[in-house]
């Protein structure tokens, strides 16, 4: 009766048809499953935890991208149950290799301590890991990040460096 | 009386997309899921898809998923059916129906006339 | 989806003659609810169809008692005891047991 229910359809008993799931708001994911013609009982939305969010519709909650943990990034916007987390300028005795082609995780910073000669955001750096770098005043601009974020947005992020 | 009107025939080019309307009159629309269905000249009928006017809310037929979007305006009692990128196979007529399901009876109970689509160079 | 295979394409008859079509379904139709959702329709010629029957055997308001409906799982026939003018045209079966609602090629009904 319902084998040609799409994914997130289930079948209606009552109207012989099928129905589309209830779709979730933003900052919310479902609970329970629903989709191939079948719906559990007790099928609902529920808020996305701490630390994660959801635009809604069937996704999951997923995770806010780390900036500091693993982009080595200042945070630009902290992340809430509707939106991830937007990534600013590299953390200071970070720099950002402009050119470099993007990878599923955005732009990452790298450490000064392999940057090429005056790089910008390096420049007065002392050797050692455990230096205290300038700030990245060079850098007024906004980050790549800002806009590498929209690209990413419904993407998860890995929490760890 | 209850009436579904239907927009009137349309030549289109191919690649083209088409928007069909049809007006509904004389119930609740938001009561009664309304349907779509495609006559192919001297042909069968096949099942579009429909929607929900109280919520928007559609399914469709896994043939016309990416061929037909259906919208509807409760302000006008109003079913909408686009069709894009179309060719000669979307040369049709396009019937709206209303769905009755009432104490589990299932069918198309009110028939629009039907709008002709033509799909020519 | 779920073939529906009338029979014949098409019937010519004379006015007041009896007249029977036959519709077969390549799955049974009858629904886990325990109702059987098959349905004929009436398309006149350059009109829209019309429901005549639903669920087997029950004339929809306003269809004459010459027409009847019967069958059962997978085989079904429509019956007109005495043709008149008003009901020449194409007779579609449909079932709506299974998604997606689907119509037999169609049964035309023209005089002899």
């Known amino acids: 009766e319902y084998s040609n229910c799409g994914e997130n359809e289930y079948y209606n008993q009552t109207t012989g048809l099928c129905q589309e799931c209830p779709p979730c708001g933003p900052g919310e994911e479902p609970y329970l499953s629903c989709g191939y013609g079948t719906k559990d009982e007790d099928y609902g939305c529920v808020p996305c935890p701490a630390e994660k969010f959801s635009k809604g519709g069937y996704q999951i909650c997923r995770r806010h991208k780390d900036c500091e943990g693993f982009f080595r990034a200042t945070v630009l916007t902290p992340g809430d149950m509707e939106n991830d987390a937007e990534c600013g300028p590299c953390l200071p005795g970070y720099y950002m290799l402009e050119n470099r082609p993007r990878n599923i995780y955005g732009m990452v910073c790298y450490s000064c301590l392999l940057a090429p000669p005056n790089t910008k955001e390096c420049v007065g750096a002392t050797s050692g890991a455990s230096a205290n770098f300038p700030g990245t005043s060079g850098s007024s601009t906004l980050s790549p990040f800002q806009h590498a974020h929209k690209e990413l947005s419904g993407q998860g992020h890995l929490a760890t460096a | 009386e209850v009436q579904l009107q239907q927009s009137g025939p349309e030549l289109v080019k191919p690649g083209a997309s088409v928007k069909m309307s049809c007006k509904a009159s004389g119930y609740s629309f938001t009561g009664y899921n309304m349907h779509w269905v495609k006559q192919s000249h001297g042909k069968s009928l096949e099942w579009i898809g429909y929607?929900?006017?109280?919520?928007?809310?559609?399914s469709k037929n896994q043939k016309f998923k990416g061929k037909a979007t259906l919208t509807v305006d409760k302000s006008s009692t109003t079913a909408y059916i686009q069709l894009n990128s179309l060719t000669s196979e979307d040369s049709a007529v396009y019937y709206c129906?209303?769905?009755?399901?009432?104490?589990?009876?299932?069918?198309?109970?009110?028939w629009g006339a039907g709008t002709t689509v033509t799909v020519s160079s | 989806d779920v073939v529906m295979t009338q029979t014949p394409l098409s019937l010519p008859v004379s006015l007041g003659d009896q007249a029977s079509i036959s519709c077969r379904s390549s799955?049974?139709?009858?629904?886990?609810?325990?109702?059987?959702?098959l349905h004929w329709y009436l398309q006149q010629p350059g009109q829209s169809p019309k429901l005549l029957i639903y669920k087997v055997s029950n004339r929809f308001s306003g269809v004459p008692d010459r027409f009847s409906g019967s069958g059962s799982g997978t085989d079904f026939t429509l019956k007109i005891s005495r043709v008149e003018a008003e009901d020449l045209g194409v007779y579609f079966c449909?079932?709506?047991?299974?998604?997606?609602?689907?119509f037999g090629a169609g049964t035309k009904l023209e005089l002899k």
């Open positions: 129906a209303r769905y009755y399901y009432g104490d589990y009876h299932w069918y198309f109970d009110v």
């Open positions: 799955q049974s139709l009858v629904h886990s609810n325990g109702n059987t959702y």
């Open positions: 449909s079932q709506h047991t299974h998604v997606p609602p689907t």
């Open positions: 929607i929900d006017p109280y919520n928007g809310a559609t």
